[in-house]
């Protein structure tokens, strides 16, 4: 395996300046998959630096990335999706640093969308629904979703609920009355595929009603 030290004790000799991370997105454009890589250090001078992936590909040995500003990107149908690929940073045809990566372990789902909240007066609850493009996909179909909500005035007090469906009920009694809430959702692979959280969906804002006292009850 070219560019590799023969043993673990030499692996850290690779140039740390060029450390990078990548994520894959499966069926991101019809049946096309994508792979996005970027340097961890935003100050790396990327002039003349190229990325290449070799191994675990269909019909070809290697593929070169396109450069888009500071990220490197491939869109292709040629990922085998089984076995490890070797992703290398190259300059003038010479590898500076490489990583062996299984593309099924670095999957980043697409962000959920169409988040909305409907108040049900009779039930005294809020029904949260959202959509995900992954319901239509053939590979990464099973996701875990993280719904986060907070009272708008509590900047860092996010409450989180994990769920596998795209519908959640929040009980009115667990929320502050007459308050403005912000809610958002993100997703992560949850069956066979592994990887990263998606970007957050756009936030949705909703207001809780005032407490409706029953007849005969007095305000405190």
């Amino acid at each position: 395996e070219s560019g590799y030290a023969q043993n673990g004790d030499l692996e850290d000799a690779e140039l740390d300046d060029y450390s990078f991370s990548c994520y894959s997105q499966l069926e991101v454009n019809g049946s096309q998959h994508s792979l996005t890589c970027a340097f961890e250090d935003p100050d790396v001078n990327t002039t003349n630096l190229e990325f290449e992936i070799c191994g675990a590909l269909v019909e070809v040995k290697c593929l070169s990335f396109r450069k888009l500003q500071e990220i490197y990107f491939i869109e292709t149908k040629k990922f085998l999706l089984i076995g490890k690929s070797n992703i290398c940073v190259k300059v003038g045809g010479k590898s500076l640093t490489c990583k062996k990566i299984d593309l099924t372990t670095i999957v980043k789902p697409e962000a959920p969308f169409d988040l909305s909240v409907i108040y049900r007066e009779g039930a005294n609850d809020f029904v949260v629904t959202f959509n995900t493009s992954h319901l239509q996909k053939k590979y990464v179909k099973v996701l875990m979703h993280d719904v986060a909500y907070r009272q708008e005035k509590d900047e860092n007090k996010w409450m989180h609920v994990n769920l596998s469906s795209t519908k959640l009920t929040l009980l009115q009694r667990n929320l502050q009355p007459e308050a403005m809430y912000e809610i958002k959702v993100r997703s992560i692979p949850d069956h066979y595929f592994k990887g990263f959280w998606s970007e957050w969906s756009p936030s949705y804002y909703f207001r809780t009603p005032e407490i409706n006292n029953s007849p005969g009850e007095m305000d405190p």
Epitope: E1, Y4, A5, Q6, N7, G8, E11, A56, L80, L81, I82, G83, K84, K100, D102, T104, T105, K138, Y139, Y192
Partner: antibody, heavy 118, light 111 residues
Framework: QVQLVQSGAEVKKPGASVKVSCKAS????????LHWVKQAPGQGLEWIGG????????AYNQKFKGRVTMTSDRSTSTVYMELSSLRSEDTAVYYC???????????WGQGTTVTVSS | DIVLTQSPASLAVSPGQRATITCRTS??????????MHWYQQKPGQPPKLLIY???NLESGVPARFSGSGSGTDFTLTINPVEAEDTANYYC?????????FGGGTKVEIK
């Protein structure tokens, strides 16, 4: 060339522990997970668990959980499997195997025979 | 656990003929076109050797007379034409779900 070399045969008494080693060479040690597979005499193959030498993260077959511990030493490119509370059913050849992908085994050690007998 | 059932348990084939081994799983081991089924050959006194990964991908260095096919719950390993050196036990293995399980094995003998 890529090689996995395992430690020698062991004879143990019931209730004892055994620690088997597997030394990797010919590739970058942290690039591939290493797994252990059991083969009892005249029987088929049984996955015990695996370790990621990069992170030290482990995954164990529930059947062996609590009795098996896998560790790795990056300085010597070696992984270890320790099996405790040995019983006669643990008599087997134990193989270490490199995971070429999730989770198939493209390189195998020569095997270590463990005999449990009173 | 996913149970893998291999058939036949043993098989005697003449050199130059075709040998077919099947492996049936208790639940699907495929995700769309990703088939998480693998095949190994084991000769007496030796460790197993990977032949096929992902149902149909030939491991580097393995002769082209070995081929694999199948999806979902039904998979096949074919040796065509069989050679004398192919006398061995053959195992299938799934990797969709932990614990990663193997079939019981098929013993292939050359007549």
């Amino acid at each position: 060339q890529v090689q996995l070399v395992q430690s020698g045969a062991e004879v143990k008494k019931p209730g004892a522990s055994v620690k088997v080693s597997c030394k990797a060479s010919g590739y970058r040690f942290t690039d591939y997970e290493l797994h252990w597979v059991k083969q009892a005499p005249g029987q088929g193959l049984e996955w015990i668990g695996g370790i990621d030498p990069k992170t030290g993260g482990t995954a164990y077959n529930q059947k062996f959980k609590g009795r098996v511990t896998m560790t790795s030493d990056r300085s010597t490119s070696t992984v270890y499997m320790e099996l405790s509370s040995l019983r006669s059913e643990d008599t087997a050849v134990y193989y270490c195997a490199r995971s070429g992908g999730r989770w198939y085994f493209d390189v195998w050690g020569q095997g270590t025979t463990v005999t449990v007998s009173s | 656990d996913i149970v893998l059932t291999q058939s036949p348990a043993s098989l005697a084939v003449s050199p130059g003929q075709r040998a077919t081994i099947t492996c049936r799983t208790s639940e699907s081991v495929s995700i769309h076109l990703l088939h998480l089924m693998h095949w190994y050959q084991q000769k007496p006194g030796q460790p197993p050797k990977l032949l096929i990964y992902g149902a149909s991908n030939l491991e580097s260095g393995v002769p082209a007379r070995f081929s694999g096919s199948g999806s979902g719950t039904d998979f096949t390993l074919t040796i065509n034409p069989v050679e004398a050196e192919d006398t061995a036990n053959y195992y299938c293995q799934q990797s969709i779900k932990d614990p990663y399980t193997f079939g019981g094995g098929t013993k292939v003998e050359i007549k």
